[in-house]
């Protein structure tokens, strides 16, 4: 059997839409699927690898290294998005490409980024962990780190990191899916909203969903003593 | 308010060594991204820049004059100091100490300079 | 180094005037600054990356360009305008400056 709730929930381009969220009730009533992974049912995904999940993790990530900072043009805010669901009148698309990024770094002003701009985090802005020296954060923005200290400053002059950012990785469901929404969404949909991070790739999903020890690579799924938990 | 002065001797010996110091307020050198960079214009001439050092003290030199300069920063006492050494009549010039902004830049600018100081090398 | 020249070396015009300065890189860059200088006075940014205005610059200022040619326009010549141009380059070490415009009245 299935639950479905119907609401009002703030999506990312800033305005209420009806949302529905499905659950499946459990059978035996008790306690919901995502509930039971967390007790340490045996959910494959959680002890090995799994092709489908993987895949859709890859397919996330490919599509996240194409993405920008779309920016409303009357300052209402801005998110992570692609550019064909960024609106080409009411917003700007803040994309880094040829030769309009900045430098790698400031010891190679040669070395053009192409990969973000991305909302909120910047390689120049970011003091902790600082992109510099033998730590230059890779031109592929889902292999940055989360920035966990911002430089001390009001404004930057960038319009990707002045705005107001209005969505965040959330991770929604068993399968370990992530999505950039808004905290408001999120929570509708029974996800977990990650306040500390700015792109999907900087989350693991899994890791959350599964609960119990984390994964001691949170690329791996590694709990194998599930088997003799349930 | 953001200000730089420069201070050092007006006139220097050939083979000398100059020693430049920028007094710098209004902002700290220890501030993430921040930057001081020297800069010189031989009377009448083009602007030339020298060499600049970066908060986490990374230094950055004009090739054609590397050996001959050392830039370095005391950020307690806010200040940048630049040495050239070996002086020579062609190096008579006003000496500009300035900071680097960043503010909505890919990359760096010159936003706020001092208001110079003339050195005359001559025997 | 990247050389970049500059043309004209000096130019005569009227208050009112429309004014444009080129600059030339001798390799391909990909952003261009530029600050006016006084005599006697440190110089002072007017654009950077091309075509953002400084602050407190006045809007008659713009700059446009890309690859190796690279433009400084005034709109409409002010008498405060009267003084020497230089452009910038921050692609790569060491930073060069263009040997400068001179604007002068007529």
């Known amino acids: 059997a299935q639950h479905v709730t119907t609401q009002l929930v703030l999506r990312n381009k800033g305005v209420y839409e009806s949302v529905k969220y499905i659950q499946q009730e459990n059978f035996w009533i008790g306690p919901s699927s995502i509930d039971l992974i967390h007790l340490g049912a045996k959910f494959s995904p959680c002890i090995r690898k799994d092709q489908q999940i993987e895949q859709l993790v890859l397919r996330e990530r490919d599509l996240e290294r194409d993405s920008g900072c779309c920016v409303q043009n009357d300052h209402s805010g801005c998110i992570q998005t692609q550019r064909k669901d960024c609106s080409e009148t009411l917003a700007t698309f803040v994309k880094w490409q040829d030769d309009t990024g900045p430098p790698m770094d400031k010891s190679d002003l040669g070395q053009k980024r192409t990969s973000g701009a991305v909302c909120h985090q910047d390689p120049r802005t970011c003091e902790e962990p600082a992109s510099s020296g033998a730590h230059i954060w890779p031109d592929d923005i889902t292999k940055w780190p989360i920035c966990t200290e911002q430089a001390k400053s009001n404004r930057t002059g960038f319009l990707h990191m002045d705005c107001q950012i209005k969505g965040r990785p959330c991770c929604i469901s068993t399968k370990g899916s992530c999505e950039i929404t808004t905290r408001e969404y999120c929570e509708f949909m029974h996800g977990y909203f990650h306040e500390e991070a700015t792109l999907c790739s900087q989350v693991h999903c899994l890791d959350k969903v599964c609960g119990l020890l984390p994964f001691l690579n949170p690329e791996v799924p590694d709990q194998f003593y599930r088997l003799w938990l349930s | 308010q953001v200000t730089l002065r420069e201070s050092g001797p007006a006139l220097v010996k050939p083979t000398q060594t100059l020693t430049l110091t920028c007094t710098f307020s209004?902002?700290?050198?220890?501030?993430?991204?921040?930057?001081v960079g020297w800069i010189r214009q031989p009377p009448g001439k083009a602007l030339e820049w020298l060499a600049h050092?970066?908060?986490?003290?990374?230094?950055y030199y004009n090739s054609a004059l590397k050996s001959r300069l050392t830039i370095s920063k005391d950020t307690s006492k806010n200040q940048v100091v630049l040495t050239i050494t070996n002086m020579d009549p062609v190096d008579t010039a006003t000496y500009y100490c300035?900071?680097?902004?960043?503010?909505?830049?890919?990359?760096?600018?010159?936003?706020?300079w001092g208001q110079g100081t003339l050195v005359t090398v001559s025997s | 180094a990247i050389q970049l020249t500059q043309s004209p070396s000096s130019l005569s015009a009227s208050v009112g005037d429309r004014v444009t300065i080129t600059c030339r890189a001798s390799?391909?860059?990909?952003?261009m600054f530029w600050y006016q200088q006084k005599p006697g006075k440190a110089p002072k940014v007017l654009i950077y990356?091309?075509?953002n205005l400084a602050s407190g610059v006045p809007s008659r200022f713009s700059g446009s360009g890309s690859g190796t040619d690279y433009t400084l326009t005034i709109s409409s010549l002010q008498p405060e305008d009267f003084a020497t141009y230089y452009c910038?380059?921050?692609?790569?070490?060491?930073?060069?400056f263009g040997q400068g415009t001179k604007l002068e009245i007529k």
């Open positions: 300035a900071r680097i902004q960043n503010y909505g830049s890919n990359y760096w600018y010159f936003d706020v």
């Open positions: 209004g902002f700290s050198l220890s501030t993430f991204g921040r930057g």
């Open positions: 050092i970066w908060w986490d003290d990374e230094k």
């Open positions: 390799s391909r860059i990909s952003y």
């Open positions: 990356d091309t075509s």
């Open positions: 910038q380059q921050w692609n790569a070490y060491p930073l060069t």
